[in-house]
Interface confidence: low
């Protein structure tokens, strides 16, 4: 299709050149148009050679435009400020790990790990998440205590055709607390952080579903699920947020070979959700109350809800027995935040429209790397920033709000010709004073073009140098918001720009 368009351009340009010749146009004009025609023909020639190679990003990846980057930076800024407010340190780890480090940590998802071609003896894989590398880092450095955040790209050989809207390279934002502490205090803080971030981002109403791996395992045991089927039945239960119980039951019975009556018992439990009262009700359940694991999990959740009430976020949390996050390494509390779509009918419950953050407790992961199997209890969360980026982008598109892609505070412009030197001197002064400034890279730009660029880029101020102003020792400062224009003495300019853009004093 693009080649056809190019051929059409060549045809039109050829006709244009013939027309100019017939009209006896000037030699310069004809030469200029012939040059254009030759360039188009050259492009067509190159295009033949390029037929095989389609210029695009690899499957499941994408570029970020300046506009998207601006959105991304804002989102990251909200997240990082929250992590820092809670006293987290920051670490970084390699993009690739030894294959052995990642092996056996992700259960069924292991098939999605990217393996690298052998590079001189070391078998390597791209990291699949930030949690396993964190556990490796703790074990390797013999750390038993740290509160850290890590924002980086991870890689999954997901087939995007099967999971639309998912990427093979994407960012994760993780916060984790490692160390032996009193039960549920760090877990409650993780949930508090999740709520703070999601509230600050203002992406809509959300709900955090909470469960515990021990409750799930205990529930499966009392319902009669064989140990060997726990994990596979877990993955079926986890689909309940997307499909009906009938479909989940069919999968358990039809595909996974579970007895229908066992599935029905599971159904009685997993379709329940509520608050602390549901925890108390299940502690009285004749079957669950006899299972040690389930009782431990329920006891911890009861305590967790006490802390969530103190943190003022209990209204955002729902104990949901169908939450069964897929990763093998979770050992205790698990949680997942979903955006809510408000009900269309009065009396209906709000609908969940996809996970935007998740996490849980994984007390055994570090022990997998320690030669002596020493465990370091850990709890953490991951913010689904890719999903959040697209929600924020959607919202901006809908509101047609202009997104600034630079932080330039002032454009240095000139009203007359031959003032390039003055513009260069002034912009340099501003840079040295820590002011974010720009100028157009032309010797004699038209004032109108400079002002047009200033408006389109959304730069708050323009400093205009004119010959008369130079003689008077002033600069005209115009504001995009108020359209007012004032003469400012050259020596006061930096201070005036700072005042108008509320920038604290800072230099390079």
């Amino acid at each position: 299709a693009d080649r056809a368009a190019l051929e059409e351009l060549v045809r039109l340009q050829g006709a244009h050149v013939r027309g100019l010749k017939e009209q006896k146009a000037s030699a310069e004009q004809i030469e200029e148009e012939v040059t254009k025609l030759l360039k188009l023909k050259a492009q067509l020639g190159q295009d033949e050679g390029k037929q095989k190679f389609v210029l695009k990003t690899p499957k499941g990846t994408r570029d970020y435009s300046p506009r998207q980057m601006a959105v991304r930076e804002k989102v990251f800024d909200v997240i990082i400020r929250c992590f820092k407010r809670h006293g987290a340190e920051v670490i970084d780890t390699p993009v690739f790990e030894l294959k052995e480090t990642l092996t056996g940590k992700y259960g069924e998802d292991s098939k999605l790990i990217y393996d690298l071609k052998d590079q001189g003896g070391e078998l390597l894989s791209l990291r699949y998440d930030l949690t396993v590398p964190f556990a490796r880092y703790l074990a390797m450095n013999k750390l038993t205590n740290i509160k850290r955040y890590h924002i980086a790209k991870v890689y999954r050989r997901d087939n995007p055709a099967m999971t639309r809207g998912r990427y093979r390279e994407f960012y994760q934002c993780d916060f984790d607390i490692a160390g032996q502490f009193d039960p549920m205090i760090p877990d409650a803080e993780c949930l508090k952080i999740m709520c703070e971030i999601l509230s600050s981002l203002q992406i809509g109403n959300f709900l955090v579903k909470v469960n515990d791996r021990r409750i799930l395992d205990g529930m499966f045991a009392v319902c009669g699920v064989p140990d060997s089927k726990f994990r596979t039945i877990c993955s079926s239960v986890d689909k309940l947020d997307k499909v009906s119980w009938e479909e989940v039951k069919n999968e358990m019975v039809g595909e996974k070979g579970l007895a229908p009556e066992v599935a029905d018992r599971i159904g009685d439990y997993v379709q329940q959700h509520g608050g602390v009262s549901l925890v108390e009700q299940l502690l009285q359940d004749p079957k669950l109350s006899q299972n040690k694991q389930a009782v431990e999990g329920l006891g911890d959740l009861k305590l967790l809800f006490e802390y969530l009430i103190l943190f003022g976020i209990d209204d955002k949390i729902s104990f949901d027995l169908s939450l069964a996050r897929g990763l093998d390494y979770y050992t205790g509390v698990i949680y997942e935040a979903v955006l809510l779509q408000m009900p269309t009918q009065a009396g209906e419950e709000p609908l969940g429209v996809g996970s935007i953050a998740a996490g849980g407790r994984y007390d055994g992961l570090v022990g997998m790397f320690d030669p002596k199997g020493r465990k370091v209890p850990c709890v953490g969360l991951s913010i689904g920033v890719e999903r959040i980026f697209s929600i924020v982008e959607q919202r901006l598109e809908a509101s047609e709000e202009k997104v600034r892609t630079t932080e330039t505070q002032v454009l240095v412009a000139s009203a007359q010709k031959k003032l390039l030197e003055e513009r260069l001197k002034l912009v340099s002064e501003l840079w040295d004073a820590g002011i974010k400034a720009e100028l157009l890279y032309k010797k004699n730009p038209k004032l109108l073009n400079q002002l047009q660029y200033w408006e389109e880029a959304g730069i708050p101020l323009v400093a205009i140098i004119g010959e008369q102003e130079l003689r008077d020792g002033v600069i005209k400062l115009r504001s995009v918001a108020s359209r007012e224009e004032v003469d400012v003495r050259r020596e006061d300019l930096v201070e005036e720009i700072r005042r108008r853009t509320n920038q604290p004093l800072s230099t390079c």
């Epitope: 299709a1 990846t61 990427y167």
Partner: antibody, heavy 122, light 110 residues
Framework: QVQLVQSGAEVKKPGASVKVSCKAS????????IGWIRQAPGQGLEWMGD????????NDNEKFKDRATMTADTSTSTAYMELSSLRSEDTAVYYC???????????????WGQGTLVTVSS | EIVLTQSPATLSLSPGERATLSCQSQ?????????MHWYQQKPGQAPRLLIK???NLESGIPDRFSGSGSGTDFTLTISRLEPEDFATYYC?????????FGGGTKVEIK
């Protein structure tokens, strides 16, 4: 130029199977997915599923999951769709169409075959 | 699955007039964002792609065709109908499996 050429019309009895072929040319076969869409007489379009010859992944419309099989032969740049246990309501024109895969999402279907009429009648 | 509803079912207009076709997506879980495409089909022919991703004009399609909308409401506009534009138009999404199409809008000569 990109072309998708489909096999000729077929008349089948209820309970039989039909296999429609779609030969692609003018582009790299493994870079794009091939979707199958059908249109019953006087009706709208219905997506049946697709196959990505580059990695042999298929996506199916649950409605046809047990009866439709999509395959691709990269050596001949040909995609196939086989529909089994035919019934009279399967009488339709079956189209193959190219859908570019980009950013992990399938694009719109930009090139279509001429269609294959399958008539199911006893 | 996402249900796409096109309106009107039939649009009777004269050449030179402006045509506005609507497509609404209904889904319990999500909007289709901008993964919406428009196709034109003439009797006895295969569909032809006009607009992809809600508003991007496919190469070789005249610029009298334009698309807009995002989320759940999408519109195809033909600014001035030419004789060859009288056909049936379908919207179709590629957001999730299964892809679905609207029932179509037939644009006929008044």
């Amino acid at each position: 130029q990109v072309q998708l050429v489909q096999s000729g019309a077929e008349v089948k009895k209820p309970g039989a199977s039909v296999k429609v072929s779609c030969k692609a040319s003018g582009y790299t076969f493994t870079d794009y997915c091939i979707g199958w869409i059908r249109q019953a007489p006087g009706q709208g379009l219905e997506w049946m599923g697709d196959i990505c010859p580059g990695d042999t992944y298929t996506n199916d419309n649950e409605k046809f999951k047990d009866r439709a099989t999509m395959t691709a032969d990269t050596s001949t740049s040909t995609a196939y769709m086989e529909l089994s246990s035919l019934r009279s309501e399967d009488t339709a024109v079956y189209y193959c169409a190219r859908g570019e895969e980009q950013l992990g999402l399938r694009n719109a279907m930009d090139y279509w075959g001429q269609g294959t009429l399958v008539t199911v009648s006893s | 699955e996402i249900v796409l509803t096109q309106s009107p079912a039939t649009l009777s207009l004269s050449p030179g007039e402006r045509a506005t076709l609507s497509c609404q997506s209904q889904s319990v879980s999500t909007s289709t964002y901008n993964y919406m495409h428009w196709y034109q089909q003439k009797p006895g022919q295969a569909p032809r792609l006009l607009i992809k991703y809600a508003s991007n004009l496919e190469s070789g399609i005249p610029d009298r065709f334009s698309g807009s909308g995002s989320g759940t409401d999408f519109t195809l506009t033909i600014s001035r109908l030419e004789p060859e534009d009288f056909a049936t138009y379908y919207c179709g999404h590629s957001y999730e499996i299964p892809w679905t199409f609207g029932g179509g809008t037939k644009v006929e000569i008044k």
